[in-house]
């Protein structure tokens, strides 16, 4: 969603849903700024390339990064 | 299951206000954006305004934009819309609409609607 | 803002016919379309989103297509609780997030 003049936050609604890791196409997360005062995630998705906002506080979403990090570290030298 | 209940329609006077609420019941209200959306007597459909789930982002119609608020109160599950400067044109019947949680916006469960009938 | 015209503005239909009606964006949208029912003196009813998905609990009898600025919902077989006022939505990623004129659908 668009930013509006005086905020730039982006999610308009955060999804709680689980998503799988294989599914993803990208992983965006956006710390907080003096333009937006909390962390946002923005996944997009192979299938379509459809974006979803993510619920930060979700169990599901913190295994998400969990496991994203983990594959991250585990092909980087 | 997911409800919306829309209420604080009425008949008021042009230049007037009034403020219209959702009570929301059955989802995790705070993850969820909400709109309001209008339709006058006989017309089609009008999107008036968005909030964020947080309440931070909020966007209008040009048609309401400086004169109609949007506010949320996610302790107690309800979202508002606060109408000034009522003109005749603002005559409707007001749904409150949950978003879909997509990045594109469509609204998935509606309100009932309550009527704003402005005449002098 | 994306203007979506609907046609034709009524449809006089028989129970058991098919119905076809057409929604055309004034530029693209993909295939971000929604369509939605209204029945008298009720709110509207998603119906399909993202041009051809059904929503929640709607019948296999509703079925959308289309991308780009074409977009058609069909109903197979008309039941009677189907003749109502269809509008049509564009889920563009910013506002205003606009709706068609409606098209209604009568019995003949």
């Known amino acids: 969603i668009p930013l509006s003049r005086t905020v730039r936050c982006t999610c308009i609604s955060i999804s709680n849903q689980p998503v799988n890791p294989r599914s993803l196409e990208k992983l965006e997360i956006i710390p907080p700024s003096q333009f937006c005062p909390h962390v946002e995630i923005i996944a997009t998705m192979k299938k379509k390339g459809e974006k979803r906002c993510l619920n930060p506080e979700s169990k599901a979403i913190k295994n998400l990064l969990k496991a994203v990090s983990k594959e991250r570290s585990k092909r980087s030298p | 299951q997911v409800q919306l209940v829309d209420s604080g329609g009425g008949v008021v006077q042009p230049g007037r206000s009034l403020r219209l609420s959702c009570a929301a019941s059955?989802?995790?209200?705070?993850?969820?954006?909400m709109h309001w959306v209008r339709q006058a007597p006989g017309k089609g459909l009008e999107w008036v305004a968005v909030?964020?789930?947080?309440?931070?982002?909020?966007h209008y119609a040009d048609s309401v934009k400086g004169r109609f608020t949007i506010t949320r109160d996610n302790s107690k599950n309800m979202v508002h819309l606060q109408m000034n400067s009522l003109r005749a044109e603002d005559t409707a019947v007001y749904y409150c609409?949950?978003?879909?949680?997509?990045?594109?916006?469509?609204?998935?469960?509606w309100g009932q609607g309550t009527l704003v009938t402005v005449s002098s | 803002e994306i203007v979506l015209t609907q046609s034709p503005a009524t449809l006089s239909l028989s129970p058991g016919e098919r119905a076809t009606l057409s929604c055309r964006a004034s530029?693209?949208?993909?295939?971000?379309v929604a369509w939605y029912q209204q029945k008298p003196g009720q709110a509207p009813r998603l119906l399909i989103y993202?041009?051809?998905n059904r929503a929640t609990g709607i019948p296999a009898r509703f079925s959308g297509s289309g991308s780009g600025t074409d977009f058609t919902l069909t109903i197979s077989s008309l039941e009677p609780e189907d003749f109502a006022i269809y509008y049509c939505?564009?889920?563009?990623?910013?506002?205003?997030?606009?709706f068609g004129q409606g098209t209604k659908v009568e019995i003949k």
């Open positions: 993202d041009a051809s």
């Open positions: 059955g989802f995790t209200f705070n993850t969820y954006g």
């Open positions: 609409a949950r978003d879909s949680s997509s990045w594109y916006v469509y609204f998935d469960y």
């Open positions: 909030i964020s789930y947080d309440g931070i982002i909020k």
């Open positions: 530029q693209s949208v993909s295939s971000y």
């Open positions: 939505q564009q889920r563009s990623n910013s506002p205003p997030w606009t």
